[in-house]
Interface confidence: low
């Protein structure tokens, strides 16, 4: 509450997160022209990345383009990309949607379609939909431990969200355990009024707000965090503004002395931990 | 503008960026003693890294040290590093400029020069100038989409920089399209009065400031961002303080059961998105 | 000091860090059943990661699980994980502490112990203590250069912590050189009243606070940073809340067409650079 007589000071904050959970992924794997069902296990080293404290990312879905090499190949025949003669292809042109630089030749992509040839990582990434349901949809049951250390330098006051009395096997609940700092990802979404299973397909950004409203006067001292959750990306966003949350990264390797890469388009949830609040003292 | 009767509150912000563009890189490649011109294509997975929302990095130049292995070798003969006898070399010494730990022996580096032998990743990195012009100088034409979600918790007000009416094929222009949030990297530099081609060689840090001056009173409501740009690194910095922006990372692999790495010294532009402003309400 | 007549404005900040140093690591390496002493050199590309400006990480210790492959194997026999019959193992169950998904079978882990079989990256990670003393304990002698650019947009004032007059071979000292922005990691810990050697084992989080108290009035202009240091993680934290600072990451590779990984549990110090302060002007 606003105490006008107090000297207010914004919070200085540091955050540390730790995600736990294992996902079993079942997907169609094609090898040597034969498609079979593949099972794999993803643990934290597979689905999350060492990021800064105030953000963490959990991969919930992906599309792989395996064994790409740098060469010439027909570009992917997305809408408006097909050609019938070389006139349609402009040497040196880089279409922002494309994945390479045109050579000026119109070449066969498959039996029925021709596209402009490009210098690129080949074969070029197929522009296919993210798998539905999401491959790591079970990430809904992962948990995250959030440690938050705060400081009001002007008041020379430091505290943290985890107290010695807390139980390490708790799970946050708005009513039953509002001070527990271990959160089930699915619960975060539920609290924010969002559907994890749906968001997991294309990815998204979820805000975990930690609000510290601290009264540092000794006679009415109070300084504990309040957690709230809200979705930060725009779920109604137009296709052209790239809805959801994804990024591409590559694993490079050499095979028979040829430099290759596997391109992974990773969809997932980026969780932003937004710490704010003030410390007031007479 | 300052309305003294209003209750002001700082902005809580979350940022998401998406870089687009392809670079064609031509460089001399030496294989088996033969030097020839190599062409390669760099796409987002090759030149950018999955970073936090409020920063993104675009590699514009690089120096590679390929096939390094952990062993003993002469250190690089930079200024003041040459020796004529073992007396000049101190066993166990780590020169901060060097890349290894001295063994105490003075050994031939090439036909004419001797340096202290070191235990290091060998051959040690050559301290050569960053290529000029920069290898990915065409990054000037890359674009970045910036999505910014802001919140004034005290006023329970949320908005974002991208509105449903916006056109996904726009490009920011200070005069003609100041609300478009797709920025050409070269334009950012031009607005900041900097030369992209020049900065791309050594790298640098560019600030994209997003200023929200929000009047949340219903009768005169206004809450839109203003973008401005300024260079954050010191272009006149003394050599000893490491001018520009670069970092080293490694790709590890095994060859004939020997652990090797390729060391990449990546130069580039780190873009920091600095969001600030206040929301005022009666 | 508080000048009530001044218009105060919070600082907008950008940070760039550069770590220097080499560590020699000696550890027992087992190959083909034979254990021998292995020496290796770690340089910046090996022990640090390209992170955001306001945080950097230095690996001080690690535990490796080499040559893991996705298959079925007995889980690690940690406290309470042993079994004597299949009844103790629940098909499809994921114990949060475990690294895989149970198959429902109880199988031999070694000559004397049986555990539940899991579908996982196998062999599963051994839950062994972090090496003591820390493998990269010599990181105490690494140095970090911190460049900080600040801006008070309302006052249209910009400055930085590194001045042209500064000497690039200085080292920060609270008394003798309080404006030098090159810090020895061990000194940071000493200033914060912490023992580097101890913290290096399990890892931790260290705050480097940069306080700008700027008087921008021309007649009494002052605007220089003050550095202070404090530990941000809780050294007395209960085991269940994951004391210290570590994360797991993986290096993936193919061997005889089988996808494998080396899992690294990296312990280290995350340094958070917390910039705060105000600029006041009449």
């Amino acid at each position: 509450s606003d105490k006008l007589y107090q000297r207010k000071e914004p919070v200085i904050s540091s955050v540390h997160t730790k995600v736990k959970g294992i996902a079993e992924v079942t997907e169609n794997v094609t090898e040597g022209g034969v498609t079979k069902l593949g099972h794999s296990i993803f643990d934290t080293a597979d689905y999350t990345f060492p990021l800064q404290g105030n953000s963490f990312f959990v991969m919930t879905n992906y599309v792989k383009s395996e064994g790409q090499v740098q060469t010439l190949c027909p570009e992917y025949p997305r809408r408006g990309a097909q050609c019938s003669s070389d006139r349609r292809c402009k040497k040196g042109w880089m279409d922002p949607q494309s994945k390479g630089i045109q050579t000026g030749r119109c070449v066969p992509y498959d039996k029925t379609r021709k596209t402009c040839e490009v210098s690129a990582w080949c074969p070029t990434e197929e522009e296919k939909e993210a798998p539905r349901p999401a491959l790591l949809r079970s990430a809904e049951n992962f948990t995250v431990l959030i440690k938050n250390n705060i400081h009001f330098p002007g008041h020379n006051y430091t505290t943290r969200n985890i107290l010695p009395t807390m139980n390490g096997s708790c799970t946050f609940h708005k009513t039953w355990d509002p001070q527990c700092s271990i959160f089930r990802l699915g619960d975060i979404f539920q609290e924010a009024g969002e559907n994890f299973t749906e968001v997991a397909v294309q990815g998204g950004i979820m805000g975990i707000e930690i609000y510290w409203d601290c009264n540092l006067d000794s006679w009415s001292h109070h300084c504990r965090p309040r957690y709230s959750f809200r979705r930060l990306d725009d779920k109604n966003m137009d296709e052209s503004f790239v809805p959801g949350y994804n990024f591409r990264y590559a694993k490079y390797y050499k095979e028979n002395n040829v430099e290759k890469r596997t391109l992974i388009k990773a969809f997932g949830i980026r969780f932003d931990i937004l710490v704010f609040g003030t410390g007031g003292k007479f | 503008s300052d309305k003294l009767y209003q209750r002001k509150e700082p902005v809580i912000s979350s940022v998401h960026t998406k870089v687009k563009g392809i670079a064609e890189v031509t460089e001399n490649v030496t294989e088996g003693g033969v030097t020839k011109l190599g062409h390669s294509i760099f796409d987002t997975a090759d030149y950018t890294f999955p970073l936090q929302g409020n920063s993104f990095f675009v590699m514009t130049n690089y120096v590679k040290s390929e096939g390094q292995v952990q062993t003993l070798c002469p250190e690089y003969p930079r200024r003041g590093a040459q020796c004529s006898s073992d007396r000049r070399c101190k066993k166990g010494w780590m020169d901060p400029q060097s890349k290894g730990i001295q063994t105490g022996r003075c050994v031939p580096y090439d036909k004419t020069r001797k340096t202290c032998e070191v235990s290091a990743w060998c051959p040690t990195e050559e301290e050569k100038e960053a290529p000029r012009p920069a290898l990915l100088r065409s990054a000037e034409n890359f674009t970045v989409l910036i999505k910014n979600n802001i919140h004034f918790p005290g006023h329970n007000y949320t908005t974002r920089n991208i509105l449903p009416t916006m056109n996904g094929s726009c490009t920011f222009h200070k005069t003609w399209d100041p609300q478009c949030s797709i920025f050409r990297l070269g334009d950012i530099f031009q607005e900041a009065g900097e030369n992209f081609t020049e900065v791309a060689v050594q790298g640098g840090i560019m600030g994209i400031e997003i200023y929200w001056d929000c009047n949340l009173d219903s009768w005169s409501h206004h809450c839109r961002p203003r973008y401005s740009f300024r260079r954050l690194d010191d272009k006149n910095m003394d050599e000893s303080f490491v001018p520009g922006y670069n970092f080293r990372y490694a790709k590890y692999y095994k060859e004939n059961n020997v652990e090797k790495r390729t060391l990449i010294k990546a130069f580039g532009i780190r873009f920091d998105i600095l969001v600030f402003g206040t929301g005022g309400k009666f | 000091s508080d000048k009530l007549y001044q218009r105060k404005e919070p600082v907008i900040s950008s940070v760039h860090t550069k770590v220097k140093g080499i560590a020699e690591v000696t550890e027992n390496v087992t190959e083909g059943g034979v254990t021998k002493l292995g020496h290796s050199i770690f340089d910046t590309a090996d022990y640090t990661f390209p992170l955001q400006g306001n945080s950097f990480f230095v690996m001080t210790n690690y535990v490796k699980s080499e040559g893991q492959v996705q298959t079925l194997c007995p889980e690690y026999p940690r406290r309470g994980a042993q079994c004597s019959s299949d009844r103790r193992c629940k098909k499809g169950w994921m114990d949060p502490q475990s690294k895989g998904i149970q198959t429902g079978r109880c199988v031999p882990y070694d000559k004397t112990r049986k555990t539940c079989e899991v579908s996982a990256w196998c062999p599963t990670e051994e839950e062994k203590e972090a090496p003591r003393p820390a493998l990269l304990r010599s990181a105490e002698n690494f140095t970090v250069l911190i460049k900080n650019n600040i801006h008070f947009p309302g006052h249209n004032y910009t400055t930085r912590n590194i001045l042209p007059t500064m000497n690039g071979s200085c080292t920060f000292h609270k008394t003798w050189d309080p404006q030098c922005s090159i810090f020895r990691l061990g000194d940071i810990f000493q200033e914060a009243g912490e023992n580097f050697t101890e913290v290096a084992v399990q890892g931790g989080i260290m705050g480097i606070e940069i306080y700008w108290d700027c008087n921008l009035d021309s007649w009494s202009h002052h605007c220089r940073p003050r550095y202070s240091f404090r530990r941000l993680d809780d050294k007395n934290m209960d085991e269940s809340f994951v004391p210290g600072y570590n994360f797991r990451y993986a290096k993936y590779y193919k061997e005889n067409n089988v996808e494998k990984r080396t899992l690294i549990k990296a312990f280290g110090i995350r340094f958070d650079i917390l910039v705060f302060g105000t600029g006041g002007k009449f």
Epitope: E66, C73, V107, P108, E255 | - | -
Partner: nanobody
Amino acid sequence: EVQLVESGGGLVQAGGSLRLSCAASGRTFSSLAMGWLRQAPGKEREFVSGISRGGTSTYYADSVKGRFTISRDNAKNTMYLQMNSLKPEDTAVYYCAGSPVLSIVLDTRGLEYWGQGTQVTVSS
């Protein structure tokens, strides 16, 4: 590992024809994009013609368009190059090559499997 063996080379008069074959073993042939390349004395290896995995798409260097025809028979694990209207400048060692990652071979890059080559000499 894939083994590729070329055959059908030889000496021929300008204007004549030759048919080269490339027999593959060791991997599912239909999973490889295949191509023909050649190297004349003192020159770099150059691309001649390429064919997709299924054989439905073909590609030719400008210098051989209309004269050479590439084809493959996946049932027989063999690729062919029918060379008509041969010219002295077609003299070279002809190599067959394959790639498990390309959908079609379009130049000399990205090829992992190579044959030993077969000599074609065109006299004037």
